[in-house]
Interface confidence: low
Amino acid sequence: NQDLPVIKCVLINHKNNDSSVGKSSSYPMVSESPEDLGCALRPQSSGTVYEAAAVEVDVSASITLQVLVDAPGNISCLWVFKHSSLNCQPHFDLQNRGVVSMVILKMTETQAGEYLLFIQSEATNYTILFTVSIRNTLLYTLRRPYFRKMENQDALVCISESVPEPIVEWVLCDSQGESCKEESPAVVKKEEKVLHELFGTDIRCCARNELGRECTRLFTIDLNQTPQTTLPQLFLKVGEPLWIRCKAVHVNHGFGLTWELENKALEEGNYFEMSTYSTNRTMIRILFAFVSSVARNDTGYYTCSSSKHPSQSALVTIVEKGFINATNSSEDYEIDQYEEFCFSVRFKAYPQIRCTWTFSRKSFPCEQKGLDNGYSISKFCNHKHQPGEYIFHAENDDAQFTKMFTLNIRRKPQVLAEASASQASCFSDGYPLPSWTWKKCSDKSPNCTEEITEGVWNRKANRKVFGQWVSSSTLNMSEAIKGFLVKCCAYNSLGTSCETILLNSPGPFPFIQDNIS
């Protein structure tokens, strides 16, 4: 039938309000209505090649590319993007069509390009081509700065390929540790691209434009410093430049420095040395190891040796793609109402992450601090003792990471009551989750001690806004209690709270709250 295409390609645009993570999925998120991408047979192509209409996506938007295959029998498939094979799990819809989906979350430039889907059915093979681009090519970009050696000069150039052209500055510090914090008087800033004074303790280059500020630190091994307890580690992606500086100070110039990679001397053209006299006529030598574009075989232990100092090493790891390593298992905490507490996530990531803390659909700024062992930590303390679900979300150019936390605040129950013609209900959000009792107040029991067990139904429900639990108890009306006062009480380890309800009274129900500690 000519009217029923064998293949249908659709684009689904997602509302970006969730932080779920994934790449290729058979069950994409609920979202907008699908947009037909046509999927016309490509003329003059060997084999059956369908081409979907070009897809333009806003930066940070989330989409699903979906193919519906109207072919009998089972199908198998494979996605290919930038020469990498991606997992593909077809499933079948209610009309028994094969459905293959590719979810792209938070679109970035690295995710733009051609997505090829190879489908094999019992009858024939197809190839479907999707071209995905970022909608407005005139995007601001802010790329992390990197270093280059200035031609024929002992100087470093700092480059950030960003639009609009960023202001590039060198941030130099000559003292140790805490005093090298950004706003410290020990910090000197130079708004220029080329740096000749390469002897400082701490050298960073920062680029800033309308999008913000990105910095790169010149990785340094200082032979005069006590080595870290854990070996320093430097991550780079294939194709990025590698720069390591080895620095040593000695009483005179009678010493030399050398670089080795896995016990083999670095080749000429991959290092250069500089030296200068310092205070008390001591001599500073620095030796740079550099590779303009790293490959996998540049991975290994780089050791700087001196004839007058103990050697020190750094582990350089070259990765194909960036990563975020952290445990993503959810964590539950319960604290007292005035207890000081911070959520924290320890992670190892490259390139540096951008992160947010989210609570009740509100995002909070995220700070990260580097630890000595190569890990970083992000803490969130601004929870204001509000119970519920807290989400840490981190991403870099290549990876995304989400971790959930639940915060429970230990407190005595607070009871709210409501009643209808047929039942009375009480609600409480205390923690730990309270237990319930219902009591009847009568002539026989003026203190409401007569317990009601019949017709009581307890449940806990998630109050979605905060992700906190609310416990409720419902009493179904019976002839035995009509017209009586009843009392519902919620109790936990921190106390008890009660509400008294007059059943079957016309008009608004009078509620009398009792607080019993």
Epitope: N136, T137, Y140, T141, S162, V163, E165, N209
Partner: antibody, heavy 119, light 112 residues
């Protein structure tokens, strides 16, 4: 210093194509957009499109869509603008200009290339 | 497309006297970042255009400070405090908020 040097004048017949080059120097080629603007004799300026040398993505004015192709060669820091199916009303001076960011003000311009379309 | 309308079409000036050119856009050029995406260019006879003012009021480096730009939203003005003989040429405003970027029709400044 920043320079944009364009290729020389061209005379073309209607229906033909023309490819104008613009060689950039004196700055990081991939850090700036390069726009193409034309000016018919005695007329005002008309924006044709833009290329991002970092990645090669392009945006064209609707009226040139399908006829214009902008490309770049990062090894030579050169951008190219090819206009096909030429008509007499395409006779104009074609300028390349360096754009600063999204708002794209043009701080440096090439010297211009006169393209004459005549049978 | 955003339509840019310039006035006057022609402006005869006396050297040493001030001059003013108006530019109006069919949509506001004020971006949420606070910038007005409106630039002014001068094209001297036989030359390529050159940037004078960007973001409505920022003077491009190297441009004499007798040139100034003002305005916001849809109405913009270029002023020359004291016209000099070298200021003759055609002045264009251009919007960079949306693609396609569009230019005003130009104002020809000539010495009386």
């Amino acid at each position: 210093q920043v320079q944009l040097v364009q290729s020389g004048a061209e005379v073309k017949k209607p229906g033909a194509s023309v490819k104008v080059s613009c060689k950039a120097s004196g700055y990081t080629f991939t850090s700036y957009y390069l726009h193409w603007v034309r000016q018919a004799p005695g007329q005002g300026l008309e924006w044709i499109g833009v290329i991002n040398p970092s990645g090669g993505s392009t945006t064209y004015a609707q009226r040139f869509q399908g006829r214009v192709t902008m490309t770049r060669d990062t090894s030579t820091s050169t951008v190219y603008m090819e206009l096909s199916s030429l008509r007499s009303e395409d006779t104009a001076v074609y300028y390349c200009a360096r754009g600063i960011g999204y708002g794209g003000y043009f701080d440096y311009w090439g010297q211009g290339t006169l393209v004459t379309v005549s049978s | 497309d955003i339509v840019m309308t310039q006035s006057p079409l022609s402006l005869p000036v006396t050297p040493g006297e001030p001059a003013s050119i108006s530019c109006r856009s069919s949509q506001s050029l004020l971006h949420s970042n606070g910038y007005n995406y409106l630039d002014w260019y001068l094209q001297k006879p036989g030359q390529s255009p050159q940037l004078l003012i960007y973001a409505a009021s920022s003077l491009q480096s190297g441009v004499p400070d007798r040139f100034s730009g003002s305005g916001s939203g849809t109405d913009f003005t270029l002023k020359i405090s004291r016209v000099e003989a070298e200021d003759v040429g055609v002045y264009y405003c251009m919007q960079g908020l949306r693609t396609p970027h569009t230019f005003g029709g130009g104002t020809k400044v000539e010495i009386k």
